[in-house]
Interface confidence: low
Amino acid sequence: VPRWRQQWSGPGTTKRFPETVLARCVKYTEIHPEMRHVDCQSVWDAFKGAFISKHPCNITEEDYQPLMKLGTQTVPCNKILLWSRIKDLAHQFTQVQRDMFTLEDTLLGYLADDLTWCGEFNTSKINYQSCPDWRKDCSNNPVSVFWKTVSRRFAEAACDVVHVMLNGSRSKIFDKNSTFGSVEVHNLQPEKVQTLEAWVIHGGREDSRDLCQDPTIKELESIISKRNIQFSCKNIYRPDKFLQCVKNPEDSSCTSEI
């Protein structure tokens, strides 16, 4: 019998996916003492169980529940940084501002960051050739459902002032179809979250516009306000200087607007 595989539109499972997940888990649990109790083989087992032998267009949040349970983690609920279309800067920020956390600073986010994975219906094989694309094939694919699940839980855990970093260089600074716009915004809990503060990151050095007045930011403000959560917005005109000032807040140049 020839090895026939469904051809999907997206790239296949990341090379060495099982080993990458296991290695990341071991590394994370070594670095984070509060997660030392985590059994990484069981984590991989639960991860694999979520998508192996299942049709990659028919994955549900329930498939990931065993993994979610094993990866349960408490982060300070008032130190959460969400981001949309500007992951690298968000991660650079939390690497400096160590008491703040993006989703990828949690175990589950760290395990899956930048990885692709999918299986095949009725076989125990991982598909390294292709995986479903969210737009061209199906939205209920293993990767999309994973991020939807962990993002929802992350947003639900947030409290007090929640920050979100947005990319001011994009045509849609706030995109309702992004994970932030479609999942996280709607799962912030009004009884716990007082304010959502958006940081709009400027791309060009000479860009002095107030991007907080952008129509998509106003749309975000409207959505958030309707949920009885306050909204505030700040322009970050110089992201390089912004990071530098996070590192060295005493620097004299850090008193001016960044």
Partner: antibody
Framework: QEQLEESGGDLVKPEGSLTLTCTAS????????ICWVRQAPGKGLEWIAC???????TYYASWAKGRFSISKTSSTTVTLQMTSLTVADTATYFC???????????WGPGTLVTVSS | AQVLTQTPSPVSAAVGGTVTINCQAS????????LAWYQQKPGQPPKLLIY???NLASGVPSRFSASGSGTQFTLTISEVQSDDAATYYC??????????FGGGTEVVVK
């Protein structure tokens, strides 16, 4: 059809060396674990070693460390090098693959290694 | 070293009857369920029957079932057929990572 086949089994003198080869047909080793298991005549199965094809990481039974060496030589071949052979190493040597490392879902027919003077 | 003890051996069964084979591990297998069962006939390689303690491998008849957790595991063959005459092995996985096989149980069908 996915198949494994062992080769290299032979009659060898004590203290001699031998290299066995496991060849895959109908598929290539991607992220499978490829393992060697042996069975002495009329006896049970004994695990020797595994290699994780994706990374090249190797795992050995405690008794096999030092005398046995597993390696992936191509996308479809894995070898087992055996040194300082004794009469007790006489067995049929099977190669087996595992989707994960904990159970073997595909086996070769085996190759006989006889150690005798 | 981890030891897997299989009992009884040999075991005989009549066609249509039921056979139960036990496998006891000297220490808990990984995740309490990383145990597999294989069938081996003379001159052939082993064939996977059960993985992760109770999951039936592809193409294996439902007459074969298994259960257990931790250190105690059982393989059951119901409605035994003459073709079931073989030696059955349990195999455990431990975190080290190491693998161990039981000594085997010969099933004789009368």
């Amino acid at each position: 059809q996915e198949q494994l086949e062992e080769s290299g089994g032979d009659l060898v003198k004590p203290e001699g060396s031998l290299t066995l080869t496991c060849t895959a047909s109908g598929f290539s080793f991607s992220n499978d674990a490829i393992c060697w298991v042996r069975q002495a005549p009329g006896k049970g199965l004994e695990w020797i070693a595994c290699i994780y094809a994706g990374s090249g990481n190797t795992y050995y039974a405690s008794w096999a460390k030092g005398r046995f060496s597993i390696s992936k030589t191509s996308s479809t071949t894995v070898t087992l090098q055996m040194t300082s052979l004794t009469v007790a190493d006489t067995a049929t040597y099977f190669c087996a693959s595992a989707d994960t490392i904990d159970y073997f879902n595909l086996w070769g027919p085996g190759t006989l290694v006889t150690v005798s003077s | 070293a981890q030891v897997l003890t299989q009992t009884p051996s040999p075991v005989s069964a009549a066609v249509g009857g039921t056979v139960t084979i036990n496998c006891q591990a000297s220490q808990s297998v990984y995740n309490n369920n990383y145990l597999a069962w294989y069938q081996q006939k003379p001159g052939q390689p082993p064939k996977l029957l059960i993985y992760r303690a109770s999951n039936l491998a592809s193409g294996v008849p439902s007459r074969f079932s298994a259960s257990g957790s931790g250190t105690q595991f059982t393989l059951t063959i119901s409605e035994v057929q003459s073709d079931d005459a073989a030696t059955y092995y349990c195999q455990a996985y431990y975190r080290d990572p190491t693998t161990a096989f039981g000594g085997g149980t010969e099933v004789v069908v009368k």
